[in-house]
Every structure is written in structure tokens, then in C-alpha cells.
């Protein structure tokens, strides 16, 4: 049974599935948004497309106490090869430029849909 247990446990999620699930989560957030997302918190914007997952996580991880994006934060961490903690600042961010979390999530959704259509799952 111990050996057979390995067959029952889920294997690694294919990148295409992980990206689709992240897109679905962002769709949920944008569609179910009633009050200002995360009380209108502001996050660092991004000015490049390379290394985008880590940069997006580095921005969003600085938003605390916002349950609406906690799942997104966890999902993004699965795409980022290194550990990200609050306060990190990537060269991908636009210094002194912040945008609302709601806009960030909306734009992230747009970008991920493009990546999905282009077959860029990593």
C-alpha cells in the first residue's frame, strides 16, 4: 500500500494547467470585485516582460491583510524559481511608480492571457 500510495498522489501540475488556473483566479478576482480591491492599496508597477512572475510576486507580496489576493500570491510563487519576501525590489519594477492593486491584477490577467495564447507556459 505504501508503494501504491505513490500512484494516487498527484504528480507535478503541467505548466499550461498552472497558468490556466492562475488566469481563472484572476478572472474571479476581477469579476467579483465590489469594494476597492485590497482597500485601494498601491503596488510597484513593472516595466519589462522578462522575469515577470517573480516581479509580479515581489509587487503583490507587499500587500498584507488582503485575503482576495492571497491565492494569487501563492500561485505566483509556484512560477518564481526563487524565494520572494516582502520588501524585495526587482530591476523590473518602475522606481517611484505605483499603481492600484486592482489595475495591477487586471493588467496581469491581460498579459497572462497573451502568454497562454502564445503557448508560453513557463
Amino acid at each position: 500500500l505504501t508503494c501504491l500510495g505513490g500512484f494516487a498522489s498527484p504528480g507535478p501540475v503541467p505548466p499550461s494547467t498552472a497558468l490556466r488556473e492562475l488566469i481563472e483566479e484572476l478572472v474571479n478576482i476581477t469579476q467579483n470585485q465590489k469594494a476597492p480591491l485590497c482597500n485601494g492599496s498601491m503596488v510597484w508597477s513593472i516595466n519589462l516582460t522578462a522575469g515577470m512572475y517573480c516581479a509580479a510576486l515581489e509587487s503583490l507580496i507587499n500587500v498584507s491583510g488582503c485575503s482576495a489576493i492571497e491565492k494569487t500570491q501563492r500561485m505566483l510563487s509556484g512560477f518564481c524559481p526563487h524565494k520572494v519576501s516582502a520588501g524585495q525590489f526587482s530591476s523590473l519594477h518602475v522606481r517611484d511608480t505605483k499603481i492600484e492593486v486592482a489595475q495591477f491584477v487586471k493588467d496581469l490577467l491581460l498579459h497572462l492571457k497573451k502568454l497562454f495564447r502564445e503557448g508560453q507556459f513557463n
Epitope: 519589462l48 516582460t49 489595475q103 487586471k106 493588467d107 497573451k114
Partner: nanobody
Framework: GVQLLESGGGLVQPGGSLRLSCAAS????????MGWVRQAPGKGLEWVSS????????YYADSVKGRFTISRDNSKNTLYLQMNSLRAEDTAVYYC???????????WGQGTLVTVSS
Amino acid sequence: GVQLLESGGGLVQPGGSLRLSCAASGFIFAWYDMGWVRQAPGKGLEWVSSINDKGGKTYYADSVKGRFTISRDNSKNTLYLQMNSLRAEDTAVYYCATAEDEPGYDYWGQGTLVTVSS
């Protein structure tokens, strides 16, 4: 909120050049396809040119092909339109706008007036 601010318009003689700029803020400019649209006095809106998010693909209306060049600098959140060999028929208000098919991603600037006259 989202802002697109055009600049660089003005009065220029036929055959002259102008460079329009569009400074973007409040959204992730680097992830958007962008474009320029113009409206001549008393006429409807006319698409001029567009560029994809990474800047590698550009598109032009036949009326400006070979004379206008669209470009972008994602590090500066800025879109450009270099206009050469200007003609009287290029006189219009030029608007910077996002160029996305997705509903809800439609953002426009206030426009900048270009007048080509001798």
C-alpha cells in the same frame, strides 16, 4: 488612475517633421499593445498606427506608410510617433490609445493637435 498624456503637436510646414510622445501612467504599459488614432477637422476617427507590447511588431495605415514610424520605450512608459514628410491632409488631433481586443482595456489620451500648413 490610468492616464495617457500626448505632447509634441503643433504647427508645421508641409514636408516638415514632428515627433509625438505619449506618457503613460497608472497601468502596466509594457503589457499593452498601443496605437495612434487621429481625427481630422469635421471627420471621423482614423487609425494611424499600432505596436505590440514588446515593440517588435508595427502596423500602419496606407495613408502614412513610409512616412510615419511608431515606437515605444517600456522603461520610460512612453509611446512615440515620428511623423516625416507631413502633408496638409495629416492635419488632425492625434490620440494615443491602448490597442487591445479584450473588453475593458480601452484607454485614450486627450489628444494633441497637429496642423500642417504653409
